[in-house]
């Protein structure tokens, strides 16, 4: 359905508040270094223009595409070349190349200072003084640090952020009320950003067929009572929504997401019995709730899949004449029967099934050839099952911090060329799988763990793509989306790696260590651990444990000393010497 003015159409559909928020997010995700005030100015200009188009859709420039309007606006920024360098060259291009150019320059690891949380009273004053600016600042700061954050979901986070301040700034103990809420929003926000980044990587690097396969598997698990046609319709709509958001078309994305939520709530009976409580909520909350909704119960009377997909002599005919429907239906049927499998495992099984049919349908006796295809699934299923079992046992034995350390050592040995900050960030997040998933019942462990690991490893892949240093990482990241995790799991000690020369400066610590938060202390120690492994990749677990125990003791001793800095100056070199001797 075409509209004379796209900008007027979206303004009317979304309303002014959401329109302004989404434009701010879009601009902040494109121009990540621009000051807040500059973005607010641009957003206000676009909003005023949109209002003129609502009043008269035939007004000058109102017929232009959103990419043209937004791109033109971004290209008015005076300091574009000084701040962004070659990104300024995008402005010489025409649409749609100009938007593609902006997208390519999105920075997953922008050089921005970490967000520092002011005192609660300071935040509450700012909130009360100018609520609108306060919330815009939140959108801006999150969006520029997370250039692929799912924009309509960020509006939901902003609404929760606002609600937290509205409630807690009136509470007797503001800090006790507010800080846990802000911590929760921060952690959920990081998780949401990482999950969306994987969706965008899936679409951009592997195409919409890969995303659709992921969506078929996930939605079939969530909505096992929905029939294939219903799941297919939801998959098509969801693919459109995420394609738009990942492509920077945030207004269209938010509008289509709202339409999808409306459709789902109008058709609950044919989708899932779990949607009811989501559908009573206001729009942003409703969309979030639908996205996070628990799996519905499996329908009764599901017969074995073997009859149609293994035992039938007509498998090859059905496959040859209707490949996409046949494979799509196989994935749907398998996924709805297996909420206990990770989506990535389900996709591997579908891939293995397709490969078997490709081979067998060209064989002399196809039926004989594919008769044991389900038996071939067994090792594919057992591999993540065993991985989860072993790692949960290790997590329960070590606790989160030491489990993270075990992963730091494991991954540094696999890919020592990767930068230390990246290894620390990724391994710490990999280690969080324990607390997140190991406490769950058996049937929920694998989907929780493996699909979470896929999100974390995608972060490694996007960071590595920006600065490629390891052929192994490139191979695991680019060959197959569904096999990324098994590819990384299978990597062993890199024998070709030349150990990093010892640098005493890396292991020199100061009294400021003592004032760090527990998390910051851990990061410091884990950074040192990575550097140790890079220096001595063949060091044993026992050797590394010894050095880390000594390190902890040395830090604890000096932080208890009267003259902390003197202690670090004196004990530091002793620790370094002892460590070198222990690792010799």
């Amino acid at each position: 359905d075409t509209h004379k003015s796209e900008v007027a159409h979206r303004f009317k559909d979304l309303g002014e508040e959401h329109f302004k928020g989404l434009v701010l997010v879009a601009f902040s995700q494109y121009l990540q270094q621009c000051p807040f005030e500059e973005h607010v100015k641009l957003v206000n200009e676009v909003t005023e223009f949109a209002k003129t188009c609502v009043a008269d859709e035939s007004a000058e420039n109102c017929d232009k595409s959103l990419h043209t309007l937004f791109g033109d606006k971004l290209c008015t920024v005076a300091t574009l070349r000084e701040t962004y360098g070659e990104m300024a060259d995008c402005c010489a291009k025409q649409e749609p190349e100009r938007n593609e150019c902006f997208l390519q320059h999105k920075d997953d690891n922008p050089n921005l200072p970490p967000l520092v949380r002011p005192e609660v009273d300071v935040m509450c004053t700012a909130f009360h003084d100018n609520e609108a600016t306060f919330l815009k600042k939140y959108l801006y700061e999150v969006a520029r640090r997370h250039p692929y954050f799912y924009a309509p979901e960020l509006l939901f986070f902003a609404a929760r952020y606002k609600a937290a301040f509205a409630e807690c700034c009136q509470a007797a103990d503001k800090a006790a009320c507010l800080l846990p809420k802000l911590d929760e929003l921060r952690d959920e926000g990081k998780a949401s950003s990482a999950k969306q980044r994987l969706k965008c990587a899936s679409l951009q690097k592997f195409g919409d067929r890969a995303f659709k396969a992921w969506a078929v598997a996930r939605l079939s698990q969530k909505f096992p009572k929905a029939e294939f046609a219903e799941v297919s319709k939801l998959v098509t709509d969801l693919t459109k929504v995420h394609t738009e958001c990942c492509h920077g078309d945030l207004l269209e994305c938010a509008d289509d997401r709202a339409d999808l939520a409306k459709y789902m709530c109008e058709n609950q009976d044919s989708i899932s019995s779990k949607l009811k409580e989501c559908c009573d909520k206001p729009l942003l909350e409703k969309s979030h709730c639908l996205a996070e909704v628990e799996n519905d119960e499996m329908p009764a009377d599901l017969p074995s899949l073997a009859a149609d997909y293994v035992e039938s002599k007509d498998v090859c005919k059905n496959y040859a004449e209707a490949k996409d429907v046949f494979l799509g239906m196989f994935l749907y049927e398998y996924a709805r029967r297996h909420p206990d499998y990770s989506v990535m495992l389900l996709l591997r099984l579908a891939k293995a099934y397709e490969a078997t049919l490709e081979k067998c349908c060209a064989a002399a006796d196809p039926h004989e050839c594919y008769a044991k295809v389900f038996d071939e699934f067994q090792p594919l299923v057992e591999e993540p099952q065993n991985l989860v079992k072993q790692n949960c046992e290790l997590f329960e034995q070590l606790g989160e911090y030491k489990f993270q350390n075990a992963l730091l050592v494991r991954y540094t040995k696999k890919v020592p060329q990767v930068s230390t900050p990246t290894l620390v960030e990724v391994s710490r997040n990999l280690g969080k799988v324990g607390a997140k998933c190991c406490k769950l019942p058996e049937a929920k462990r694998m989907p929780c763990a493996e699909d979470y690991l896929s999100v974390v490893l995608n972060r490694l892949c996007v960071l590595h793509e920006k600065t490629p240093v390891s052929e192994k990482v490139t191979k695991c990241c680019t060959e197959s989306l569904v096999n990324r995790r098994p590819c990384f799991s299978a990597l062993e000690l890199d024998e070709a790696y030349v150990p990093k020369a010892f640098n005493a400066e890396t292991f020199t610590f100061h009294a400021d260590m003592c004032t760090l938060s527990e998390k910051e202390k851990q990061v410091k120690k884990q950074t040192a651990l990575v550097e140790l492994v890079k220096h001595k990749p063949k060091a044993t677990k026992e050797q590394l444990k010894g050095v880390m125990d000594n390190f902890a003791a040395f830090v604890e001793k000096c932080c208890k000393a009267d003259d902390k800095e003197a202690c670090f100056a004196e004990e530091g070199p002793k620790f370094v010497a002892a460590s070198q001797a222990a690792l010799a």
Partner: antibody, heavy 120, light 108 residues
Amino acid sequence: EVQLVESGGGLVQPGGSLRLSCAASGFSLSSYAMNWVRQAPGKGLEWIGHINAGDIAYYATWAKGRFTISRDNSKNTVYLQMNSLRAEDTAVYFCARGAGGFSTGPFKLWGQGTLVTVSS
Amino acid sequence: AFELTQSPSSLSASVGDRVTITCQASESINSRLAWYQQKPGQPPKLLIYDASDLTSGVPSRFSGSGSGTDFTLTISSLQPEDFATYYCQGYGGSSTTTFGGGTKLTVL
């Protein structure tokens, strides 16, 4: 409500043709293999054929050539075209839904049937 | 295509009796066999699928067993509403399906 309703039955002369319809409600036909089964008066069930989710039709050996199954997903209806009808084709014709898109059985959902009488 | 031989073709029994109906396939169909109950003027009703899985809502006095070529439907204790005609159906070996000849269960 999930149901199947057959229509188009009636009296037809030997050698004549008839097209039966099976309208689905409460679900999408395109997600399932849709079957036709008949039952002559006082006799057992006899499978005629089906059309699967890939729009591929399969028939019982005896039905090939004279009977054609098709569907119109936009109308959520499946059809059985019967040609060169004979007296022994007199039966109640049922429409039945397969368990999945490529299933030949089992059939949990059946229509009430429509009677076809072939007589001069 | 395979054939299904159902026996007996008719059977008389009393309320409370244990009744067994068998179905034999001319070739192995693994566990791909269903059992239906049909009453006059009604479509068949699915009782058992995949040889031994009971359809939801069907009383537990109905049970199925067997695999390969030999299958059995058992009604452990006949109830008045169980007098009807029973059919087996073999499926899954190809995109065709076959019904047995039927067993008419009547009151003794």
